[in-house]
């Protein structure tokens, strides 16, 4: 049994890493191999990551944390029974990738303007939470060609869009993500889409 | 009550040996790091050794390397100070003390929270 | 190892005067975003130590809003807002960042 790419981790900044390996044949990962992980920190002590499948010789391993500090790091050791396959280590605040943000609404009751509202994945006390920016993205479902990205550079969970930017009578979509340049982070996944029919009073053309 | 009660301090000749027991109650003692704390006659502080709650990491101080070992029996809620090869200036009053939380993936500390009244050991001839 | 200095190394105070206590570290005690490793201990007369304040200033359970601790990175301080008469012991810093732990050589507070 050989390990055929080496894990890499990703990390939620608050209490969750993400690690994802491939092994050289199809594996029950549950049961043949562990994932022992441990802060580079005195007195501390290992704690034991049980990985599941993901795809033939994929494996995955949630890596519980308490929370998540700049200055951690973490030694990974990937064990088949008393076999060691790897040893490695992982700096989290290295490769964050922020939670999706949650809750995405849209106000149409505001008059000919769009309000797009959503949460902040993260809670008050952790550092993420006012280093997050954003990117809405709305389509139509019925035009694939009308897609576009919204940037929101500003703290505020929230998009005001006029509605005739949008083509009126028809239907889209809109998700979100978040991402941090203090920490160069990924981006988070897509939240959920929320759909709802845009529609407006167009203005009468003078002639 | 949180309650950490040593024994196992006397009189010992240079070269001889003691044991000395921390016995912890009050608390889950197997998710907590323990320490030994000294203070020899007339002098301040002094750390000796450190464990982990699962007594896998042990730390000591280079004045005890390769003389003293530490140890703890969880399911006894027992710590302990195997003293070997003793000297002179190992004369001292020895407290144990609850050290941080380390069931935890980060060990959480409070501070020494606790500590036991002491136990005097003596080498001298 | 890191050398812990405190000063003074005598404090007589009158009672209800404020005191304060300084400690310095060789080397920063500071992990990350506000974990500063640096407690103080007093050591009553005949007593064990017991804990006054952790993680530089997070008072211990039991002990009077008198007591406060600050500083960050080498620096600290333990202030006593009023003292009292009941006060009056050894006071230690010490650092548990690193092993060795060590400990300042101990402040002693008198009453004038």
């Known amino acids: 049994m050989k390990v055929l790419q080496e894990p890499t981790c990703v990390s939620d900044y608050m209490s969750i890493s993400t690690c994802e390996w491939k092994m050289n044949g199809p594996t029950n990962c549950s049961t043949e191999l562990r994932l022992l992980y441990q802060l580079v920190f005195l007195l501390s002590e290992a704690h034991t990551c049980i990985p599941e499948n993901n795809g033939g010789a994929g494996c995955v391993c949630h890596l519980l944390m308490d929370d998540v500090v700049s200055a951690d790091n973490y030694t990974l050791d990937l064990w088949a029974g008393q076999q060691l396959l790897w040893k490695g280590s992982f700096k989290p605040s290295e490769h964050v990738k922020p939670r999706a943000p949650g809750n995405l609404t849209v106000h149409t009751n505001v008059s000919d303007t769009l309000l797009l509202t959503w949460s902040n994945p993260y809670p008050p006390d952790n550092y993420l939470y006012n280093h997050l920016t954003y990117a809405v993205n709305i389509w139509s479902e019925n035009d694939p060609a009308d897609f576009r990205i919204y940037n929101v550079t500003y703290l505020e969970p929230s998009l005001r869009i006029a509605a005739s930017t949008l083509k009126s009578g028809i239907s889209y979509r809109a998700r979100v993500r978040a991402w941090a340049q203090c920490y160069n982070t990924t981006w988070s996944e897509w939240s959920p889409s929320t759909k709802w029919h845009n529609s407006y009073r167009e203005p009468f053309e003078q002639h | 009550e949180v309650q950490l009660v040593e024994s196992g301090g006397g009189l010992e000749q240079p070269g001889g040996s003691l044991r000395l027991s921390c016995a912890g109650s009050?608390?889950?003692?197997?998710?907590?790091?323990m320490t030994w704390v000294r203070q020899a006659p007339g002098k301040g502080l002094e750390w000796v050794s450190s464990?982990?709650?699962?007594?896998?990491?042990?730390y000591y101080a280079d004045s005890v390397k390769g003389r003293f070992t530490i140890s703890r029996d969880n399911s006894k809620n027992t710590l302990y100070l195997q003293m070997n090869s003793l000297r002179a200036e190992d004369t001292a009053v020895y407290y144990c003390?609850?050290?941080?939380?380390?069931?935890?993936?980060?060990?959480?500390?409070?501070?020494?929270?606790?500590w036991g009244q002491g136990t005097t050991v003596t080498v001298s001839s | 190892d890191i050398v812990m200095t405190q000063s003074p190394l005598s404090l007589p105070v009158t009672p209800g005067e404020p005191a304060s206590i300084s400690c310095r570290s060789s080397q920063s005690l500071l992990y990350s975003q506000g974990y500063n490793y640096l407690d103080w201990y007093l050591q009553k007369s005949g007593q064990s130590p017991q804990l006054l304040i952790y993680l530089a200033s997070n008072r211990a359970s039991g002990v009077p809003d008198r007591f406060s601790g600050s500083g960050s990175g080498t620096d600290f301080t333990l202030k006593i807002s009023r003292v009292e008469a009941e006060d009056v012991g050894f006071y230690y810093c010490m650092q548990s960042l690193f092993t060795p732990y060590t400990f300042g050589q101990g402040t002693k507070l008198e009453i004038k």
């Open positions: 464990i982990s709650g699962s007594g896998s990491n042990k």
């Open positions: 003390a609850k050290d941080r939380l380390t069931s935890r993936v980060r060990p959480y500390y409070y501070g020494l929270d606790v």
């Open positions: 009050g608390f889950t003692f197997r998710d907590y790091a």
